[in-house]
Interface confidence: medium
């Protein structure tokens, strides 16, 4: 394999230095004609995409909060985490009507809300996928070793949550850093990573460390739990637990439908960008489309959740009657004889979970 | 999608002057290399002086002493003022310039792309 300097490669810009060309001269066959191409989409398109997420994802996440919050008695490890999962998306969902704003008039909103807006963009992926990953961990516990521990240390649990944030704003600091509004002269500013002329060596470690401890560490501890957990059941035959887990998984397999193709576009790209793999102007160009294509089902996914819980989670429609019940707003008659508060659906004595 | 947009070229005697400036539009975050190539009827392409964002000048040896490239960074425009010029100065002028855009339908992300204008035409005759 050929041998490169980083620094050669990273001289000019933080993303390429592949030499695209547009407007060529015919007369001039000696440089290959290649624009830089991302996906067209009419920005009204967009916007709309934003305005439909975040009145999903205002409204739904806002039930799973209320419902979770109000049944304080049943609430589960798996619920604790839900309601930091719904936190999460709730708090990206705030964003939406600012990059929709955005969209049409340029980034009218100054570097401050540009790196805050940008950060809980990253923080509400990293801490959705450290959330799945301690759920799973949590669910392989409690089925596969039978542990009561975190059950009964509810201190544990918050810890482990306050740990999720940090970690999640650790991850999502080169954004924070690095993000800023640039004036542009000819088009509207824009709210734009620009890491001006860092070193080869920051480049890389601000692209492979979140990748690797955002991405694929928790997806292979999420892969190990769930694998030994479904072992466990289909073994045991327990019906009952395999019903129980039945949202987990609709929950994870969500995630991963929404978030592992824009991630493994983005792993290509940092392939191409270190040489591992050979980098042309088509495969350049595929990957920018490829980029804007999957990168919309990661927004998608903040809306998706409360869905889950309503079509499958029978707990936590249980839950959500019982609050309208409560104030009045339907007949207690309606209630559901067996109503528990939590809103998965027990998969042990001690360590119930909630969708 | 940017645009390189040239003017300056015409008709010129020997041993007299031209200016042809450069104006880069589009989505542009930064200009890396501004420069001036041409290329001569039946000849091949090549360069005649190149100016990095830094202020680094490279001219090509013919037209040492005789040629001066500036640029201004504000205005995203190259500029070159050909003095003393002779008949073998004559050829179509094309700008060039190394920019760093950005595409991206969610998120903006940042390309280097090399990108070329239509070309001017210089002649030098009596």
């Known amino acids: 394999m050929q041998s490169f300097n980083f620094e050669d490669f990273w001289e000019n810009e933080d993303f390429s230095n592949y030499s695209y060309s547009s407007d060529l001269p015919p007369s001039l066959p000696d440089v290959a004609p290649c624009r830089p191409e991302s996906l067209e989409i009419n920005k009204y398109f967009v916007v709309i995409i934003y305005a439909l997420v975040f009145l999903l994802s205002l409204l739904g996440n806002s039930l799973v909060m209320l419902v979770i919050l109000h049944s304080r008695v049943g609430r589960s490890i798996t619920d604790v985490y839900l309601l930091n999962l719904a936190m999460a998306d709730l708090l990206f969902a705030l964003t939406l009507p600012i990059w929709a704003a955005a969209k049409v008039n340029g980034w009218i909103f100054g570097t401050f809300l540009c790196k805050v807006v940008s950060l809980l963009k990253e923080v509400n992926f990293y801490s959705g996928i450290l959330l799945l990953a301690c759920i799973s961990v949590d669910r392989y516990l409690a089925i596969v070793h039978a542990t009561r521990t975190l059950t009964q240390k509810r201190y544990l649990v918050k810890f482990v949550c306050l740990s999720i944030w940090s970690l999640s704003l650790l991850l999502a600091l080169p954004v924070l850093l690095f993000r800023r509004t640039v004036y542009l002269t000819y088009i509207s500013p824009v709210c734009y990573e620009d890491m001006g002329n860092n070193t080869a060596k920051w480049r890389m470690v601000l692209r492979i460390l979140p990748q690797t401890f955002g991405f694929i560490l928790p997806l292979l501890i999420m892969l190990f739990c769930y694998g030994f957990t479904l072992r466990t059941l289909f073994k045991a035959h327990m019906g009952q637990k395999h019903r129980a887990m039945r949202v987990i998984f609709a929950v994870v397999l969500i995630f991963l439908l929404c978030w592992l193709p824009y991630h493994l576009v983005l792993l290509a790209d940092t392939l191409m960008r270190t040489r591992l793999i050979n980098e042309t102007c088509q495969r350049r160009n595929n990957i920018d489309q490829a980029l804007d294509a999957t990168e919309i089902l990661g927004i998608l996914h903040s809306c998706l959740n409360p869905l889950i819980y309503a079509f499958i989670g029978q707990k936590f429609r249980h839950g959500l009657l019982k609050i309208l019940a409560t104030h009045g707003l339907i007949s207690k008659d309606s209630l559901p004889k067996d109503s528990r508060p939590s809103f998965v659906g027990s998969s042990s004595g001690h360590t119930s979970t909630t969708l | 999608e940017v645009q390189l947009l040239e003017s300056g070229g015409g008709l010129v005697q020997p041993g007299g002057s031209l200016r042809l400036s450069c104006a880069a539009s589009?989505?542009?975050?930064?200009?890396?290399?501004m420069g001036w190539y041409r290329q001569a009827p039946g000849k091949q392409r090549e360069l005649v002086a190149d100016?990095?964002?830094?202020?680094?000048?490279n001219y090509a040896d013919s037209v040492k002493g005789r040629f001066t490239i500036s640029r201004d960074n504000s205005k995203n425009t190259v500029y070159l003022q050909m003095n003393s010029l002779r008949p073998e100065d004559t050829a179509v002028y094309y700008c060039?310039?190394?920019?760093?855009?950005?595409?991206?339908?969610?998120?903006?992300?940042?390309?280097?792309?090399?990108?070329w204008g239509q070309g001017t035409l210089v002649t030098v005759s009596s």
């Open positions: 060039n310039a190394e920019i760093v855009v950005l595409v991206g339908v969610w998120t903006q992300r940042a390309r280097t792309g090399n990108y």
């Open positions: 589009g989505s542009i975050v930064r200009i890396n290399t």
């Open positions: 100016i990095t964002s830094g202020g680094n000048i």
